[in-house]
């Protein structure tokens, strides 16, 4: 691979409503399948065609579930995961970890089980500075014509 | 992608036995549901068999229950069915299928949508 490659992270809370068919999608991951290298979380592995994760839209294949209705995901076995997700009733509410791929340099490619990433902060605050330079010197410009 | 290959086909006499292998792709196979099909001539595809990730729960179609095993080894990315006391009705083709990780709905193993990834099939001929 060349160049490296990184990943904005996000958090978001994810309410779903079990449909006829369940929420529909699957999992990896537990302290007995370490999908990720040095992870034992739990990741989507799967989002079935409109079942309703899809439905909903914002869940997507590769995100980390950090909880269930509340309850975290930390330290599980992949069995009592998805035993977790079973038995979590109607209303099922997700904290769910989004990563973002960045390009930086030349071709990357996201291995599968690999999603080691960066704080969006690392992004964002460089961002915001470059933007307040920016709109600084335009505002110097103006005063000068 | 994850690729399936099958093997281990062949032409059997009835009481005879195969043992069928999948082979797949994939640096997180350990994390497979895997399942056998099968389809005869003019025949919809039947489910034989399926295994969970870690080999410690499989699935049976009845009329295989008994005589087929299912079994996979994760050092060596392969599924396995070993038939033993083939019968003529057993002759079709044989379909290994995939799907990454464990659904969190209830898991009906003989649902081919259940699968993401399918083989080419490998000819069983019980005479």
């Known amino acids: 691979m060349n160049g490296r490659v990184d990943y904005l992270v996000t958090e978001e809370e994810i309410n779903l409503t079990r449909g006829p068919s369940g929420l529909g999608f699957n999992i990896v991951g537990g302290t007995d399948q370490q999908y990720v290298s040095n992870d034992s979380g739990i990741y989507v592995s799967r989002i079935k065609e409109n079942g309703a994760a899809a439905l909903d839209g914002r869940l997507q294949e590769g995100d980390k579930i950090l909880s269930v209705n509340g309850q975290d995901l930390k330290n599980l076995l992949h069995q009592d995961a998805v035993d977790l997700f079973r038995n979590a009733g109607y209303a099922v509410s997700l904290r769910v970890q989004h990563r973002l791929q960045v390009q930086n340099g030349p071709i990357g490619h996201r291995g599968e089980g690999d999603p080691s990433g960066i704080p969006i902060f690392m992004v964002l605050v460089p961002v915001f500075a470059l933007t307040m330079v920016a709109a600084w010197a335009f505002m110097r410009y103006r005063q000068q014509l | 992608d994850v690729q399936l290959v099958e093997s281990g086909g062949g032409l059997v006499q009835a009481g005879g036995s195969l043992r069928l292998s999948c082979a797949a792709s994939?640096?997180?196979?350990?994390?497979?549901?895997l399942g056998w099909f099968r389809q005869a001539p003019g025949k919809e595809r039947e489910f034989v068999a399926a295994?969970?990730?870690?080999?410690?729960?499989?699935y049976y179609a009845d009329s295989v229950k008994g005589r087929f095993t299912i079994s996979r080894n994760n050092a060596k990315n392969t599924v396995y069915l070993q038939m033993n006391s083939l019968k003529p009705e057993d002759t079709a083709v044989y379909y290994c299928?995939?799907?990454?990780?464990?659904?969190?709905?209830?898991?009906?193993?003989?649902?081919?949508?259940?699968?993401?990834?399918w083989g080419q099939g490998t000819q069983v001929t019980v005479s």
């Open positions: 994939g640096r997180t196979f350990s994390t497979y549901t």
């Open positions: 299928a995939a799907v990454i990780g464990s659904t969190v709905d209830s898991y009906d193993p003989g649902d081919p949508l259940e699968y993401d990834y």
């Open positions: 295994i969970n990730w870690s080999g410690g729960t499989t």
